[in-house]
Interface confidence: low
């Protein structure tokens, strides 16, 4: 999907309003600083792009983000503001359904949603223009 | 434990330059912004400029464009700050202080110790 | 340049009062951030985004306002409390208000 011309303002303030608080939730016992953010994106789209991938596809060691409550609330912004995204989005659901497994809280987990909130910080921050 | 550190009082004549140097430790300093402040004796605080470590990108106030430059050494994580053509004015502390996206808002959650700065002939 | 106007500039209170500080811009800005600083101190963040409360600040303060009219409230002045505070905003680069002292009575 193309994230080009999804409303980012209105992204963002979802993000503020709620999914952030909700990432924090998901960390919450965890030291800031216990993991390097090793993912990184240079414009919105793009941050978008990653934040989608490490959200909903499923990874070695962590195979349960999708039904957070984050994930849902991201799921829901991308809907609203990015035309078209739902429509992409109805057969990679249908696939996660059927391959859902019990909620697991893994170490692998916590560190992939800290790498989601450096993505967020990203994507809230456009960078200052070079001068 | 984020920490900013900054270099030593600096004493320096009208027409010089001063080099504040402010290193960085606890987070990746990548990913926040870093601002300079600062303040002459019994004066408001007063925003310089802000830079982003990620590229470089900079954004001055215009009261100083010009006379000020500011960049980062990444591979050191450490913020520095040049100010030109000094005037007995421009003494001052010179803060450092990284800008996190915590709440609503960019805010300067953590600040260097200051660096003071005298001009005078 | 958004210009921060805090008033007053001095407030002489005695310990167990109410303390109102107040900061308006020049023009509306989203949120307003506030900062305590002592002598000889650099700044420590106090309130972020007009009303949340920065990590350890007692429950006695807090922030409220919209657009160009923000305030700072302790609801009761304890010794530790007198100090410099200063507001700022970055709806337009970075601007901080000239302070408003709060001094023992």
């Known amino acids: 999907y193309d994230f080009t011309n999804c409303d980012f303002e209105k992204i963002k303030a979802a993000y503020l309003s709620t999914i952030s608080k909700d990432l924090i939730t998901y960390m919450s016992g965890t030291k800031s600083t216990e993991f390097n953010n090793t993912v990184s994106c240079s414009n919105r789209p793009h941050c978008l792009t990653e934040i989608q991938s490490l959200t909903f596809n499923p990874t070695a060691g962590c195979a349960s983000l999708a039904k957070e409550m984050f994930a849902m609330k991201t799921k829901a912004a991308l809907a609203i503001w990015c035309p078209g995204y739902s429509e992409t989005q109805i057969n990679a659901t249908q696939a996660m359904k059927k391959r859902r497994k019990r909620k697991v809280t893994t170490n692998k987990c916590l560190e992939q949603v800290s790498q989601l909130q450096g993505l967020w910080r990203r994507f809230n921050r456009p960078l200052l223009k070079q001068q | 434990e984020v920490q900013l550190v900054q270099s030593g009082a600096e004493v320096k004549k009208p027409g010089a330059s001063v080099k504040v140097s402010c290193k960085a430790s606890?987070?990746?300093?990548?990913?926040?912004?870093m601002n300079w402040v600062r303040q002459a004796p019994g004066q408001r605080l007063e925003w310089m400029g802000i830079?982003?470590?990620?590229?470089?990108?900079?954004s001055y106030n215009q009261k100083f464009k010009g006379r000020v430059t500011l960049t980062v050494d990444k591979s050191a994580s450490t913020a520095y700050m040049e100010l030109s053509s000094l005037r007995s004015e421009d003494t001052a502390v010179y803060y450092c202080a990284r800008e996190d996206y915590d709440y609503d808002g960019y805010a300067m959650d953590y600040w260097g110790q200051g660096t003071t700065v005298t001009v005078s002939s | 340049e958004i210009v921060l106007t805090q008033s007053p500039a001095t407030l002489s209170l005695s310990p167990g009062e109410r303390a109102t500080l107040s900061c308006r811009a020049s023009s509306s800005v989203s949120y307003m951030h506030w900062y305590q600083q002592k002598p000889g101190q650099a700044p420590r963040p106090w309130i972020y985004?007009?009303?949340n409360l920065a990590s350890g600040v007692p429950a006695r303060f807090s922030g409220s306002g919209s657009g160009t009219s923000y305030t700072l409230t302790i609801s009761r002045l304890e010794p530790e409390d007198f100090a410099v505070y200063y507001c700022?905003?970055?709806?337009?680069?970075?601007?901080f208000g000239g302070g408003t002292k709060v001094e023992i009575k």
């Open positions: 985004a007009t009303s």
């Open positions: 830079i982003s470590p990620y590229n470089g990108g900079t």
């Open positions: 606890g987070y990746t300093f990548t990913d926040d912004y």
């Open positions: 700022q905003q970055w709806s337009s680069d970075r601007t």
